[in-house]
Amino acid sequence: PKQTLPKPIIRAESTYMVPKEKQATLCCQGSYGAVEYQLHFEGSLFAVERPKPPERINGVKFHIPDMNSRKAGRYSCIYRVGELWSERSDLLDLVVTEMYDTPTLSVHPGPEVTSGEKVTFYCRLDTATSMFLLLKEGRSRDVQRSYGKVQAEFPMGPVTTAHRGSYRCFGSYNNYAWSFPSEPVKLLVTGDIENTSLAPTDPTFPDSWDTCLLTRETGLQKDLALWDHTAQNLLR
């Protein structure tokens, strides 16, 4: 079998949902010593970066300015050390937003409910679209999809305090081209009287994986790596 290097990690810096005409930044984290990184888009080569010096950095950033529907889709990356290529990274879906119109999000029976109540979100957009998406702030990877001509329902079932938080919806023109976001709707779920005060609201931190953790190798790291390699050889 043909030898390959471990697959790199691909991430979107800040978010995978990029407003049209804004810049997307994708990070490809491979390994120290990689002389070339390639970004692939829908299976075709999109961009190349050669880090300098290659032994001092474990990944690169690919910048995609002027985001539009032609650049929205599935991205992956690979890297090369010497003549040896890595496996392909997982696929990353890059979405362009702020296309066309703005939907309206509402919630029934209302934004303030008691734990155990059934809640349904409604997303409405009058321009032609059939797919709607509901996202909770701080959980942008957990996208709920629903279908309808001008309106879609998102039944939540009996809610708990874990459902608390801000929600937005989008109309989708295809999997990678979304409308402007709706205005947020904040769902407040009160629990049993004794533990209402204890139930924390859901954090609205940005998604932890939407950051680029590229590092430059210091002399100390290099010495430790060399020492570790020598120790491994001695143990053998």
Epitope: L45, F46, V48, R50, K61, H63, K71
Partner: nanobody, 126 residues
Framework: EVQLVESGGGEVQPGGSLRLSCAAS????????MGWFRQAPGKEREFVAA???????YYAESVKGRFTISRDNAKNTVYLQMSSLRAEDTAVYYC????????????????????WGQGTLVTVKP
């Protein structure tokens, strides 16, 4: 707004050479990544060569060793030196730019480019 104007096209015999130029207007040239694409009659536009802000280059396999891309930031111009030309190099050659860009990315996919020239025709025939 960036405007790109290609020149240097013409008719040449197989084995001959040509140098294409692409003059860019605007102050953003130094922060632009540049590329050359070509389109032969009845075919799709294809990547030829590209250059990053800091002069890193990348070539299509079909032109590697024969074509050289370079840039002169003082003149806001990118060049494509073509040698050992073949009949299959006959096409309209387009200059393109990615503006703005950061880092040292070299762009290969046509979708990456947001500014395009009108093209210059290169014909290779005996």
């Amino acid at each position: 707004e960036v405007q790109l104007v290609e020149s240097g096209g013409g008719e040449v015999q197989p084995g001959g050479s040509l140098r294409l130029s692409c003059a860019a207007s605007g102050r953003t040239f130094a922060s632009a990544a540049m590329g050359w694409f070509r389109q032969a009659p009845g075919k799709e536009r294809e990547f030829v060569a590209a250059i990053s802000r800091s002069d890193d280059t990348y070539y299509a396999e079909s032109v590697k060793g024969r074509f050289t891309i370079s840039r002169d930031n003082a003149k806001n111009t990118v060049y494509l030196q073509m040698s050992s030309l073949r009949a299959e190099d006959t096409a309209v050659y387009y200059c393109a730019a990615v503006v703005p860009t950061y880092g040292n990315n070299i762009y290969v996919h046509s979708a990456a480019y947001n500014y395009w020239g009108q093209g210059t025709l290169v014909t290779v025939k005996p």
